[in-house]
């Protein structure tokens, strides 16, 4: 079924992108984590079969390509003990400047609430700092800084973050010129910031997992996005042209064709990898979508309790994320002692 | 310890509609796809559909769309498969099996077609 | 439909013995999947993803092959072995099995 291999690479580059060789190799080598993927993703058991043959391919290409994959699991693991402090402060002062906000939120254009701005508040980032992030081309018109997405990004975008039509809709429409401005300047320099705690690795966001049950559920809730993405853009007329294509797919054909007799299964190959869980950092990029709409001057008059009400349970998630990220911190500087 | 428990047998007439239930325990109901089998006596086995207890969503073998149809109660932990339009091709064992693999099986619910 | 040819259909081995059975498949599949029924009981899960032993399964079994060709082996024959073995793919739907070969001790 082409859809299906098209979707397949979709997948493989998603992986190669966002997720470690060792969450990766977890993901094959653990029938829990499978099962929980799968489900999390909706897979027809023909996809789920087609996806884990080229993710066994992937692997083993990351695990030659990677020689020291399992150093770099140390490295981040250390980056986050001296970084996690920091975070935890600022993400701690966030959560306190949300819930204040929460009390006199406004509408922020038309009727629009939070649920329109932060596509699916904690799925691997925010939809509208992806629609900046993706490159997403800002420019005026009218006297009015507009978002609108060249057909290619606009695949991309939705391909890969699976946002949903409603925040593409909205990117499109109009803001103020100040408003637009202070998202796409203060998104850009936070992205700048995250780039440099995470180095070259900015895009492996799940290269730092919450836990096998969280990891396993946001890998298979990506894909499932971007499954759905895959199929609405197979449904509008003109999106092939912008369908976004994989340059090197790896695919049940490519990358190892045969089998050998002495070739060590993935199983074998990750046998004796410590993987210790540690939670997302990406999330840490929701709250900065929010302040950019919501700390404006421009809001409208009039408070919706309703957004008040949103913005209360974004608080309140980010502080179960949080306690989530703190409990790892415990056990990693645990392990350390050890 | 995981363990998928099968509706009793069930003897019906031609043209009715009948429904099975699965209820599974020992793991998280959510987190594991569930399968439906046929076999009919002496013979091999048939893939009827899966289905995903955490949102619903269906797949069926193009053969049994519309024929079966496949549900869940999130609370009971119970898989649920409905026939419909019953005829004595339907008379078999029907297995309800768990996850990506089929790695746990209930075991069946034998439906007996006559009139 | 991608139809899955098991042979022998019936093969009776002695205690001891190593035994193979095949299962081709018309088109190339990703996975072979087995399962092992005895008379009267459901179906268990034998090997998975084409070489995996699921828990339990002695490891005088063994499952191997890639495309069309794919074998389920044991090394030594016991009795407990006994039964019908069948064959899956999960490639193409319809998801299908194979006839099944049935095991005897001979």
């Known amino acids: 079924d082409p859809e299906s291999s098209i979707f397949i690479e979709d997948a493989i580059k998603y992986f190669k992108e966002k997720v470690s060789t060792q969450n990766l190799l977890l993901l094959l080598t653990d029938n829990e984590a499978w099962n929980g993927f799968v489900a999390a993703a909706e897979l027809p058991r023909n996809e789920a079969d087609e996806l884990r043959k080229a993710l066994d391919n992937l692997a083993r290409q990351m695990i030659m390509k990677d020689k020291n994959w399992h150093d770099k699991g140390q490295q981040y693991r250390n980056w986050f003990l001296k970084e996690f402090p920091r975070l935890k402060s600022k993400l701690e002062d966030n959560i306190r400047r949300l819930r204040a906000l929460a009390d006199g939120v406004q509408k922020v254009h038309k009727g629009t609430t939070i649920a329109n701005v932060v596509s699916g508040s904690l799925s691997i980032s925010s939809g509208i700092l992806t629609l900046v992030g993706m490159g997403l081309a800002p420019f005026t018109e009218g006297g009015s800084l507009v978002l609108l997405e060249p057909g290619m990004e606009l695949g991309i975008t939705a391909a890969l973050t699976g946002i949903t039509s409603s925040t593409i809709d909205y990117g499109k429409k109009w803001w103020t010129q100040a408003q637009a401005h202070d998202l796409v300047i203060k998104s850009l320099d936070k992205l700048k910031e995250v780039k440099e705690f995470l180095g070259e690795n900015i895009s492996n966001f799940l290269s730092l997992a919450g836990n096998t049950y969280q990891l396993t559920r946001g890998i298979g809730k990506d894909i499932r996005a971007l499954r759905r993405a895959r199929a609405n853009l197979q449904s509008v007329p003109h999106a092939s042209a912008s369908r976004p294509r994989v340059t090197e797919p790896i695919s049940a054909e490519s990358g190892e064709q045969v089998e050998r007799v002495n070739e060590p299964s993935i199983l074998e190959m990750s046998r004796g990898v410590k993987l210790t869980d540690v939670a997302p950092v990406s999330f840490f990029l929701v709250l900065d979508v929010v302040y950019l709409v919501y700390e404006s001057k421009h809001l409208h008059e009039g408070a919706k309790s309703e957004t008040a009400e949103e913005l209360k349970k974004v608080a309140q998630e980010l502080e179960e994320k949080l306690n989530i990220l703190n409990n790892n911190y415990k056990i990693l500087q645990a392990d350390q002692e050890l | 310890q995981v363990q998928l428990q099968q509706s009793g047998p069930e003897l019906v007439k031609p043209g009715a509609s009948v429904k099975m239930s699965c209820k599974a325990s020992?793991?998280?109901?959510?987190?594991?796809?569930i399968s439906w089998v046929k076999q009919r006596t002496g013979q091999g086995l048939e893939w009827i559909g899966e289905m995903f207890p955490g949102s619903g969503t269906t797949y069926y073998t193009e053969k049994f769309r519309g024929k079966a149809t496949l549900t869940a109660d999130k609370s009971s932990n119970t898989a649920y498969m409905q026939l419909s339009s019953l005829t004595s091709e339907d008379s078999a064992v029907y297995f309800c099996?768990?996850?990506?693999?089929?790695?746990?099986w209930g075991q069946g619910t034998t439906l007996t077609v006559s009139s | 439909e991608n139809v899955l040819t098991q042979s022998p259909a019936i093969m009776s081995a002695s205690l001891g013995e190593k035994v193979t059975m095949s299962c081709r498949a018309s088109?190339?599949?990703?996975?072979m999947y087995w399962y092992q029924q005895k008379s009267d009981a459901s179906p268990k899960l034998w090997i998975y993803?084409?070489?995996n032993l699921a828990p339990g399964v002695p490891a005088r079994f063994s499952g191997s092959g890639s495309g069309n060709s794919y074998s389920l082996t044991i090394s030594s024959m016991e009795g407990e072995d006994a039964a019908t073995y069948y064959c899956q793919q999960f490639t193409s739907s319809p998801y299908t099995f194979g006839g099944g070969t049935k095991l005897e001790i001979k």
């Open positions: 993803y084409t070489s």
């Open positions: 088109s190339s599949v990703n996975y």
């Open positions: 099996a768990r996850g990506t693999t089929a790695d746990y």
């Open positions: 020992g793991y998280t109901f959510t987190d594991y796809v």
